[in-house]
């Protein structure tokens, strides 16, 4: 069977949504209304990796496109980056490492750590319109808290 | 015993609200995700919102979306309801289950609280 | 979204005939499928998930099967205790849905 996959939108904890910035990357900002029409909707597909009841390994593509979050190493440190592939061959159960996230719940706080780069965290600023990013760091100033609404395909 | 028991139902008139709510026992609460489905009178099932173990993740679908907000407060082991605009075609049977978005099935009911719209 | 569709509707059998209920779905559901058992005036029960797994404490006599579009679910010899509504649930894209329900009776 193929990999399940799921379409839901993300909020960070302080309810900035995730929109495209130019055509491979991600920024946060506060949105309102009809434009929340422009939030970035993620196929999270449900992969193969060490799972557990607060942790699910999963990767997140954006919506009927061939672009997966992925991260990688870039002047030595770990980055966060829109990766284009080959959308005949995914999303697929056995997904490269680095297209792989695994999705912690705890206490109503939702985490996407980079299974490539242990405690590496999809990550925002808390300013207005900064991209998205992978930080090495919680609990500081940047913010790796985040919601999840799942929507119907 | 693993249980659940809703309350909160009861007749309300068109666009008004209501909050029901929903007591578990006999197992971890906040270990699992959280359902609600209804039923209208004669009619079959309908899955109309759910929330993660932890309370990050919600579902809506179409029928409900922005009207019915899920909530949970896992440290009294509480699944909510809040239903507002309410309208006639929201009548029915409505059961807090165990499960949804993740794994998929319902595993545990409740007993049902019957929630009735009309003027 | 993908629609369900039970058949029959409804049907009547015999203590210890073979009773089999279909769940066919609007596209290929993978095995994403759930049957649920629903007495007169109680809660629905979970009886199978996966098409084919049985939950725990249903007894044998209940047994499902099938893949892509098309499945089935069977009581090899019906109980008295079996009179209810059977539904089935997808749970292969949001929203997950339930069939219209196939109700059994004892002739």
């Known amino acids: 069977a193929p990999v399940r996959s799921l379409n839901c939108t993300l909020r960070d904890s302080q309810q900035k949504s995730l929109v495209m910035s130019g055509p491979y990357e991600l920024k946060a900002l506060h949105l309102q209304g009809q434009d929340m029409e422009q939030q970035v909707v993620f196929s999270m597909s449900f992969v193969q990796g060490e799972e557990s009841n607060d942790k699910i390994p999963v990767a997140l593509g954006l919506k009927e496109k061939n672009l997966y979050l992925s991260c990688v190493l870039k002047d030595d440190k770990p980055t966060l980056q829109l990766e284009s592939v080959d959308p005949k061959n995914y999303p697929k159960k056995k997904m490269e490492k680095r297209f792989v996230f695994n999705k912690i719940e705890i206490n109503n706080k939702l985490e996407f750590e980079s299974a490539q780069f242990p405690n590496w965290y999809i990550s925002t600023s808390q300013a207005e319109n900064m991209p998205v990013f992978l930080g090495g760091t919680k609990g500081g100033q940047d913010i790796t808290d985040f919601t999840m609404q799942f929507v119907s395909s | 015993e693993v249980q659940l028991v809703e309350s909160g139902g009861g007749v309300v008139q068109p666009g008004r609200s209501l909050r029901l709510s929903c007591s578990s026992s006999?197992?971890?609460?906040?270990?699992?995700?959280m359902s609600w489905v209804r039923q209208a009178p004669g009619k079959g099932l309908e899955w109309v919102a759910y929330?993660?173990?932890?309370?990050?993740?919600?579902y809506y679908p179409d029928t409900v979306k922005g009207r019915f907000t899920i909530s949970r407060d896992n440290s009294k082991n509480t699944l909510f309801l809040q239903m507002d605009s309410l309208r006639a075609e929201d009548t029915g049977v409505y059961y807090c289950?165990?499960?949804?978005?993740?794994?998929?099935?319902?595993?545990?009911w409740g007993q049902g609280t019957p929630v009735t719209v009309s003027s | 979204g993908i629609q369900m569709t039970q058949s029959p509707s409804s049907l009547s059998a015999s203590v210890g005939d073979r009773v089999t209920i279909t769940c066919r779905a609007s596209?290929?559901?993978?095995?994403?499928l759930t049957w649920y058992q629903q007495t007169p005036g109680k809660a629905p029960k979970l009886l199978i998930y996966?098409?084919?797994t049985l939950a725990e404490g249903v007894p044998s006599r209940f047994s499902g099967s099938g893949s892509g579009t098309d499945y089935t679910f069977t009581i090899s010899s019906l109980q008295p205790e079996d009179i209810a509504t059977y539904y089935c649930?997808?749970?292969?894209?949001?929203?997950?849905?339930f069939g219209q329900g196939t109700k059994l009776q004892i002739t």
């Open positions: 929330i993660s173990h932890g309370g990050a993740g919600t």
């Open positions: 996966n098409a084919k």
């Open positions: 006999g197992f971890i609460f906040s270990r699992y995700d």
């Open positions: 649930q997808h749970f292969w894209k949001l929203p997950y849905t």
């Open positions: 596209g290929n559901i993978y095995n994403y």
């Open positions: 289950a165990r499960g949804g978005v993740y794994k998929g099935y319902f595993d545990v």
